[in-house]
Every structure is written in structure tokens, then in C-alpha cells.
């Protein structure tokens, strides 16, 4: 009995034409939604003039269907038992699952002003930037529609910059008609314990963003894991969204549509400072904003974002140190709503339900050369938005899963 099931599982989770895993891997049968909450700034003038705390009010959800496109350029390499692919990006707005439209307006940090002042610290260049910011009538904050903020707009300030810079700005620009990868993953033919584990990303085994082991590409992409998952395991996975590998640990048994699954969560330890968790020392890349690497709960991914001062955190600065959120009013971190989890069917290693939550923030610093940043008296890590990307196995698929996998075992 058990040996036969193990044999069947080992055969069916291999990533090659004809297996159950491959069919679902090429194009996920699960509907995946990405919900956005935008942090609408309530007091832009007070912040700019008096360096007040930023008062934010989250507005959302604004929901998009994502990851509905099949993997592209799928190429098996029998020599090293890998399969490579591109994951195309696409997002379709779902009005019925949203509180408003893509034309809704938000007061947010001026992304270009914050980024340019960080990318060009040279004081004389900042004097020039100041001229262009003023000439374009830009300010520290701006009003943008949801569509502009997420998917891109032509920035009036950057349009004046005499250097060859991209004038398009957006939190996820460019997104539609782009692809993530190339990923090269083990197909499991030679060793099922390696199935779906990433061998290389963009042709490399490391990222070139971090020092030491922090730079490694570990584990899978979290859509699945090698079969026969144990509760004691630490599940490693790589997320290109956060430009790093991370891990999840077992939290509880969950019954998902009649299927027993293991809930794995990202522990607070993964977001700790090197003081609390020495393993994280190589994720601390600068000493000033991080207060000599004592701050926690935010990750500086500027190296991965062409030098733009992007910081990733959990929503509402969950698991972050008090100094990070002390400049922001209106945040209410809540573990249930704001943590990330994966519900994994342990026999196959398939992720049958997940909620990936993350917040995108931008650093803005005082600059005595740039008038709109001149009156700031401190650094701000400004929350722009947070997202909740979720997927749950459909009822039909769950039924099939129960009959073909869990039913046979029970």
C-alpha cells in the first residue's frame, strides 16, 4: 500500500510532460488574486513644512487577478535534470472584488523625488534636481490614481532630467507584458527530493544583492516543495518580489476542503535584526537607517531596485522595531491579517492555499539642497501600499485531490 502510493507520488510530482504536477505547474489551476491597500497620506503639508509624523489611512482592497498566464519558454535539460522557464506577469483588475476603481485618487509620496534625492546624493547635482523639481511643480507628495501608482505614469520632474533616465515611474512598473526569470529548477527525475528546487535564477546561483549566504537562491518558488514534507522541516523558498530567499516553519494542522494540510508561516525571527538573530547579519547593508543594524522588520532592497530606496516589510510594519514606525501614524499591525502563510499538502508537497503579504515602503531623507525636502528633520520609511496575494485550491480540484491522494492514503 504505502510503497505503491510513494511510487505513484514520486512519479506524479516530477516536472515533465504527462504528470499531474507538470500540468498544474505550467498553468496553475488555482485562481490567484492580489489585493492592494494604498496608504493615503492625510497631512502632506504638515509633513513637508513641519516634519510632522505622516498620518496614513489605508484604502482597499483593490483586487487584481494575477499569475493566470502559463509559463513560457519551458525547456527540459536531460543532462542535469532541470527545466527552465519564464513566469509571465499579468494583472487584470477585478471591480467586483474592489472598493473602488483604478481611477481612484491617492495622496502618496512623490516616488521620483524621493528616489532621485537618494540616487544622486551629490549636493551640486541635488541643487540641479531642486531646479527641475520646482520647474515641474513637483512636491514631496503627489496625487495619483491607483492605475498610475501601481502600473506607471510619466513623471513631470523626471521628464526634465537631462540625463538618460526612464521617465516612467510606478510601484510595479513595468509589469504587464514582462516576465520573471529565467528560472531553472530541478525536475525531480533523478532525485524527487530536489523537485522544484531552483538551480539558477537569471542564469546564476546567487543574486549579487547581498553578502555571504544571504545572497544564495535557496529552495523552490513556494508554489510547491519536494514531497513528503515533515513538520520539523524548515521550508526554504526564493521570492523575487523581496529579492531574497526566506523560510517558513510549521505552525499548525489545517483542514482545507477536506484535505489535511500543514500550515507553514514566516516566523518573526526571519525579520529580526542581527542582534536578535545573527543569521540575518548579511541582510543589513547599511548602518545609518538601520541604526547600526539594530532596527528590524524592514529590508533595504535598493540594490535590487536600481538604487531606488525601496524597503520591504510586512504590512503595517508587523514584526518591525518601534523606531521604524515612530514617524507614521495610523498603522495597526495584526498577525492574523498581516503575516504570510503557506498551506502545504505534505504528501505531494503542493501548496494548496497561501497568503503572501508584504508592504512596499520608500525611504525619504532630508536634503538641504532640495526645497521640498529641506524642512524635514528626520528620515522617514514611508509606507506606500501593502498587498495580499492569495490562492486557494478550487472545489473541483480539491475533490480530485481528495479522491486521488488523501483518500487513497486514508
Amino acid at each position: 500500500g504505502d510503497m505503491l502510493i510513494q511510487k505513484t507520488i514520486k512519479k506524479e510530482v516530477v516536472l515533465e510532460e504527462g504528470t499531474i504536477a507538470f500540468k498544474n505547474w505550467v498553468k496553475t489551476g488555482t485562481e490567484i488574486y492580489r489585493q492592494f491597500w494604498i496608504f493615503d497620506v492625510q497631512n502632506p503639508q504638515e509633513v513637508m513644512m513641519n516634519s510632522s509624523n505622516i498620518q496614513v489611512k489605508q484604502r482597499g482592497p483593490y483586487t487584481y487577478r494575477v499569475r493566470f498566464l502559463a509559463k513560457e519558454n519551458i525547456t527540459q535539460d536531460p543532462k542535469d535534470n532541470t527545466v527552465s522557464f519564464l513566469q509571465p506577469n499579468g494583472a487584470i483588475f477585478e471591480p467586483s472584488l474592489s472598493v473602488g476603481t483604478e481611477a481612484d485618487n491617492f495622496t502618496v509620496l512623490n516616488l521620483a523625488v524621493a528616489a532621485a534625492s537618494h540616487i544622486y546624493p551629490n549636493p551640486f547635482v541635488q541643487v540641479v534636481l531642486n531646479s527641475l523639481i520646482n520647474k515641474s511643480k513637483s512636491s514631496m507628495f503627489q496625487v495619483r490614481t491607483l492605475r498610475e501608482l501601481l502600473w506607471g505614469y510619466t513623471d513631470p520632474f523626471l521628464s526634465l532630467v537631462p540625463y538618460p533616465v526612464s521617465t516612467r515611474v510606478g510601484m510595479f512598473y513595468p509589469y504587464n507584458n514582462t516576465a520573471d526569470g529565467v528560472y531553472k529548477v530541478f525536475n525531480g527525475k533523478d532525485s524527487i527530493s530536489k523537485v522544484a528546487i531552483i538551480d539558477t535564477y537569471k542564469g546564476k546561483r546567487n543574486l549579487s544583492y547581498w553578502e555571504s549566504y544571504c545572497d544564495m537562491i535557496n529552495g523552490t518558488d513556494a508554489a510547491s516543495f519536494p514531497p513528503f514534507v515533515e513538520k520539523s522541516q524548515v521550508l526554504q523558498f526564493f521570492s523575487s518580489d523581496i529579492c531574497r530567499s526566506i523560510y517558513a516553519v510549521f505552525e499548525s494542522d489545517v483542514n482545507l476542503k477536506g484535505i489535511p494540510v500543514y500550515r507553514f508561516v514566516l516566523p518573526s525571527k526571519a525579520f529580526a535584526s542581527p542582534v536578535q538573530n545573527p543569521d540575518n547579519h548579511c541582510f543589513c547593508t547599511e548602518k545609518i537607517i538601520s541604526k547600526n543594524c539594530t532596527s528590524y522588520g524592514v529590508l533595504d532592497i535598493s540594490k535590487c531596485k536600481e538604487g531606488k530606496p525601496v524597503y520591504i516589510s510586512l504590512p503595517h510594519f508587523l514584526y518591525a522595531s518601534p523606531d521604524v514606525s515612530e514617524t507614521i501614524d495610523g498603522l495597526n499591525p495584526n498577525e492574523e491579517e498581516h503575516r504570510t502563510y503557506l498551506d502545504i499538502e505534505p504528501i505531494t508537497g503542493f501548496t494548496l492555499q497561501f497568503a503572501k503579504r508584504l508592504q512596499v515602503n520608500l525611504l525619504v531623507k532630508p536634503s538641504n539642497k532640495i526645497q521640498v525636502l529641506k524642512r524635514l528633520k528626520r528620515n522617514y520609511i514611508v509606507p506606500i501600499l501593502w498587498l495580499n496575494e492569495t490562492g486557494t485550491i478550487g472545489d473541483e480540484k480539491a475533490k480530485m485531490f481528495r479522491s486521488q491522494v488523501t483518500g487513497k492514503i486514508n
Epitope: N122, P123, V125, V127, N130, S131, K135, N368, Q371, K374
Partner: antibody, heavy 116, light 107 residues
Framework: QVQLQQPGAELVKPGASVKLSCKAS????????MHWVKQRPGQGLEWIGE????????NYNQKFKGKATLTVDKSSSTAYMQLSSLTSEDSAVYYC?????????WGQGTTLTVSS | DIVLTQSQKFMSTSVGDRVSVTCKAS??????VAWYQQKPGQSPKALIY???YRYSGVPDRFTGSGSGTDFTLTISNVQSEDLAEYFC?????????FGAGTKLELK
């Protein structure tokens, strides 16, 4: 069209002070930092300092601290540079230049002659 | 302060020639260098910023190059109106400093 009006010449006695003016037009005066540069006859250019007309915040070349004082009058869109305790070493052409894409617009300069 | 050395005070050229004016910085200034042209009795005119970018309206016979400590302004096909003094300037750090100038004159 950016225009910078500077008096053509000033003649002053050693030990005295002088206030050179630079009247700007053709752009929003408070939006652009104003720089001042000195050029002695047959010699190179020396940067004196800069001022932000929006709040009168000024930065100086250490060499000119105590010698030059930069101010602005927003109402008349005019930048000023006061030079004190004048000596023959201060005889030079003084240029004002607002920073747009760089030092890309210079006034015609004021020739200061310090002589008894 | 960063010192900019323009080793040649004068350079002789003929109309149609190609001429290179050099500027050496006492320390690394990246590409934070500008070039200016000054004719007698006139104020300086900006030609190049960021070592190699031409200001709008500047003829394309003017080319800037270099990074770190060594910079060059090249004028290809010299015209009579190009006979002037040329200054380099660094804006990598304050105080801003200028080279002593190179005067271009007819042979």
C-alpha cells in the same frame, strides 16, 4: 528667457564695503539656487558660494567666509553679495548664475575696482 | 579642496583641426565635471555637464570624455568662433573648483 541684470562696474575705496546686485527675470526666482563666481583679470574662476532664495540659506567657500555675504530680496527677485574690508585683491569681475541644469546661465558680471 | 590642472595654458590650432583640451583632478571626481567656454569680455558659456553630456544648443563638434581624474574636451573641425578660453569645473564636492583655463588661439 532667463535674464540676469548686473551693474557693469563699481569703483570703491580700500577698506570699504560694496553690495553687488543681480536682478533675475524670466524664471521663478525662489525656485533656483543662485551661485556667485569671482574672476580676476587674466586669471581663472573661483566659486564664492550659493544661496537658496526660498529661505536665504547660504553655503560659502571657506576662503570667502567673512569676506562675502549672500542675501536675496524675494519681492524684487534680486540676489545680493556684500563684500567687506575691500583690498586690491578683491578687484575682479563677479558673476551671478542661477542653477537650472547646471551653471548654464551667467550674468554679464560686475567689474569691481578697488582703488584709492 | 580639489585642484583641477589644465596643463596647457595656450593651444595653437587651425580652422578645421581637431584639438583636445585636458583637465586633471587632484582626486577622483567621478564624472562630476563641466566645461565652459569664455570669449574676451563675455561671461562663461556652459558646454558640457557630467563629463560627456552636451548642453542643448551646443554644436556636436564639442565632445567631453573621461572619468575619475582625467578629462578631455575635444573640438573636432575647429571653427573661428571656437577661439576662446576653456575652463573645466568639478562639482563632485564643495567648494566647487575650476581649472585655470586653456586659451585656444590661431597658429
Amino acid at each position: 528667457q532667463v535674464q540676469l541684470q548686473q551693474p557693469g562696474a563699481e569703483l570703491v575705496k580700500p577698506g570699504a564695503s560694496v553690495k553687488l546686485s543681480c536682478k533675475a527675470s524670466g524664471y521663478t526666482f525662489t525656485s533656483y539656487w543662485m551661485h556667485w563666481v569671482k574672476q580676476r583679470p587674466g586669471q581663472g574662476l573661483e566659486w564664492i558660494g550659493e544661496i537658496d532664495p526660498s529661505d536665504s540659506h547660504a553655503n560659502y567657500n571657506q576662503k570667502f567666509k567673512g569676506k562675502a555675504t549672500l542675501t536675496v530680496d524675494k519681492s524684487s527677485s534680486t540676489a545680493y553679495m556684500q563684500l567687506s574690508s575691500l583690498t586690491s585683491e578683491d578687484s575682479a569681475v563677479y558673476y551671478c548664475a542661477p542653477i537650472h541644469y547646471g551653471l548654464d546661465n551667467w550674468g554679464q558680471g560686475t567689474t569691481l575696482t578697488v582703488s584709492s | 579642496d580639489i585642484v583641477l590642472t589644465q596643463s596647457q595654458k595656450f593651444m595653437s590650432t587651425s580652422v578645421g583641426d581637431r584639438v583636445s583640451v585636458t583637465c586633471k583632478a587632484s582626486q577622483n571626481v567621478g564624472t562630476n565635471v563641466a566645461w565652459y567656454q569664455q570669449k574676451p569680455g563675455q561671461s562663461p558659456k556652459a558646454l558640457i555637464y557630467s563629463a560627456s553630456y552636451r548642453y542643448s544648443g551646443v554644436p556636436d563638434r564639442f565632445t567631453g570624455s573621461g572619468s575619475g581624474t582625467d578629462f578631455t574636451l575635444t573640438i573636432s573641425n575647429v571653427q573661428s568662433e571656437d577661439l576662446a578660453e576653456y575652463f573645466c569645473q568639478q562639482y563632485n564636492s564643495y567648494p566647487l573648483t575650476f581649472g585655470a583655463g586653456t586659451k585656444l588661439e590661431l597658429k
